[in-house]
């Protein structure tokens, strides 16, 4: 029950985190116009990871793409790129756990193909988060970095007698969606990798095989226990190891290591 | 068409107050910002503020800050300017205009003329 | 507060003749967000309110004749009439449209001989 509970809880939070990281890549706020100098701007700049946008105080609202691919900074092409394997990866292991669930039947799928198949999502969001946060800190580096070398050149004067003054940007929403998003999809991946350990079988698994003369064999147990035929019409499985809530045909039978034939 | 009507022309004594009005019509009110602007007889063009009307949202001049209130009545399409402790250097022609992209002023009202006397 | 200076403060035209009106701000209305020079110019002509010329220093709003051109970038703008006419005596003022409060210039007054 803890087993499924945890897988359960470790896809919904990957779905949200990835759900997160897709909103993140598509927002349009990573870097914002800072406001320190004048927090009532009438013209207000902010710019994403795909166009920049212009909103003026009337209200008019003005995108603008990136319409090359070459003249873009090496670093914003790789946030994107980041973001965008986040996402590729996030989504693939978002179709593995679908079918690693417990709660879901497909078939005659094993409990090991089921723990394979969790675990292989699990990494796949851990990768994912750690895409996205690595996307984003990349990005808020580049914004920092930018930040103070726009200030120490915030006003440049012509003969010291007209100011230009330099847009400066700073952390957008979208930067605090994709740390989140990133972190809920590392903690998702986290959650599905010991899930993982909880179905897995943690004993090898041996099938119980009795072995018979031709004629009528008798296994003898030493110490004095009561002998059992091999192969009697009446012989099951007895439950000899309760590793938890399991059912009947989960549970193997383990030889001793005092057991002769 | 788009119109803004404005109240008639106000004669009032120092340190009282008194209320423009904006009518609004041939648009959606709430969909653009409406501003103020003073003009002193003779002079040039004063921006006094500005009021979202949707929001009630409002930016003032902070030289003028106090003696302007802005506010706006979205069921009469109407935006209002309080100006309170009038003295004579409030004497002036006081216009409402429709702010538009590229934070332009595309109509304006027709103006209303406030004078402070004793 | 951006400080706006126009020059000349009056000018005295024949008509038909081309005019230049210059418009100067203390800081750049440039904004690098969409390449865009956020300087409004307005026409008043006596006991009207002012009109609408020329936004983002130089789109034409809509209904304004073509011999209005708006140019400059930065600081340094200007407002060309290629061939006066004599309904455009007026007061012409620039605004900056960029920084609150947004000031306006004193004013060019245009006069026809």
């Known amino acids: 029950m803890a087993v499924t509970a945890c897988q359960g809880l470790g896809f919904v939070v990957s779905l949200i985190g990835i759900a997160g990281i897709i909103a993140a890549t598509c927002m349009d706020q990573w870097s914002t116009q800072d406001l320190y100098n004048n927090p009532v701007t009438a013209v207000f700049n902010y710019q994403g990871l795909w166009r920049s946008c212009v909103r003026e105080s009337s209200g008019f609202t003005e995108c603008r793409g990136y319409f090359t691919l070459l003249g873009l900074p090496a670093m914003l092409q790789a946030v994107r790129a980041l973001m965008i394997v986040g996402i590729v990866l996030g989504a693939i292991g978002l179709l593995v756990s679908i079918f690693a669930l417990k709660c879901i039947r497909i078939g005659s799928m094993e409990d090991s193909a089921k723990a394979n198949m969790t675990l292989t999502s699990g990494i796949m969001f851990i990768v994912s988060g750690l895409c996205a946060i690595a996307g984003v800190s990349v990005f808020a580096n580049m914004l920092v970095t930018n930040f103070w070398m726009s200030t120490a050149n915030m006003y440049t004067g012509m003969g010291g007698m007209v100011q230009t003054v330099q847009t400066r940007y700073t952390f957008g929403a979208a930067l605090f969606v994709g740390w989140v998003a990133g972190g809920l999809t590392l903690i998702g991946g986290v959650m599905m990798c010991i899930a993982c350990r909880g179905l897995a079988p943690e004993e090898t698994n041996y099938k119980a095989v009795s072995y018979h003369a031709s004629g009528h064999s008798v296994a003898y147990k030493p110490g004095g226990f009561k002998a059992s035929t091999g192969f009697g019409s009446n012989t099951k499985n007895k439950k000899i190891y309760d590793g938890g809530a399991r059912t009947e045909d989960e549970v193997q039978s383990y030889p001793s290591k005092h057991d002769y034939v | 068409q788009v119109q803004l009507q404005q109240s008639g022309a106000e004669l009032v004594r120092p340190g009282t107050s008194v209320k423009v009005s904006c009518k609004a019509s041939?648009?959606?009110?709430?969909?653009?910002?409406i501003e103020w602007i003073k003009q002193r007889p003779g002079q040039g063009l004063e921006w006094i503020g500005v009021?979202?009307?949707?929001?009630?949202?409002?930016n003032y001049n902070e030289k003028l800050k106090g003696k302007a209130t802005l506010t706006a009545d979205k069921s009469s399409s109407t935006a209002y300017m309080q100006l309170s402790s009038l003295t004579s250097g409030d004497s002036a022609v006081y216009f409402c205009?429709?702010?538009?992209?590229?934070?332009?002023?595309?109509?304006w009202g027709q103006g209303t003329s406030v004078t402070v006397s004793s | 507060d951006i400080v706006m200076t126009q020059s000349p403060s009056s000018l005295t035209v024949t008509a038909g003749e081309k005019v230049t009106l210059s418009c100067k701000s203390s800081?750049?209305?440039?904004?690098?967000?969409?390449?865009?020079?956020?300087l409004t110019w307005y026409q008043q002509k006596p006991g009207q309110p002012p009109k609408l010329l020329i936004y983002?220093?130089?789109t034409r709003e809509s209904g304004v004749p073509d011999r209005f051109t708006g140019s400059g970038s930065g600081t340094d703008f200007t407002l060309t009439i290629s061939s006066v006419q004599a309904e455009d005596l007026a007061i012409y003022y620039c605004?900056?449209?960029?920084?609150?409060?947004?000031?306006f210039g004193a004013g060019t007054k245009l006069e026809l001989t």
């Open positions: 605004q900056n449209s960029y920084s609150f409060p947004l000031t």
């Open positions: 009021i979202n009307p949707g929001s009630g949202g409002t």
């Open positions: 041939g648009y959606a009110f709430t969909n653009y910002l």
């Open positions: 205009a429709r702010y538009v992209k590229g934070n332009a002023l595309d109509y």
């Open positions: 983002w220093a130089s």
């Open positions: 800081q750049s209305l440039f904004n690098s967000g969409n390449q865009k020079n956020y």
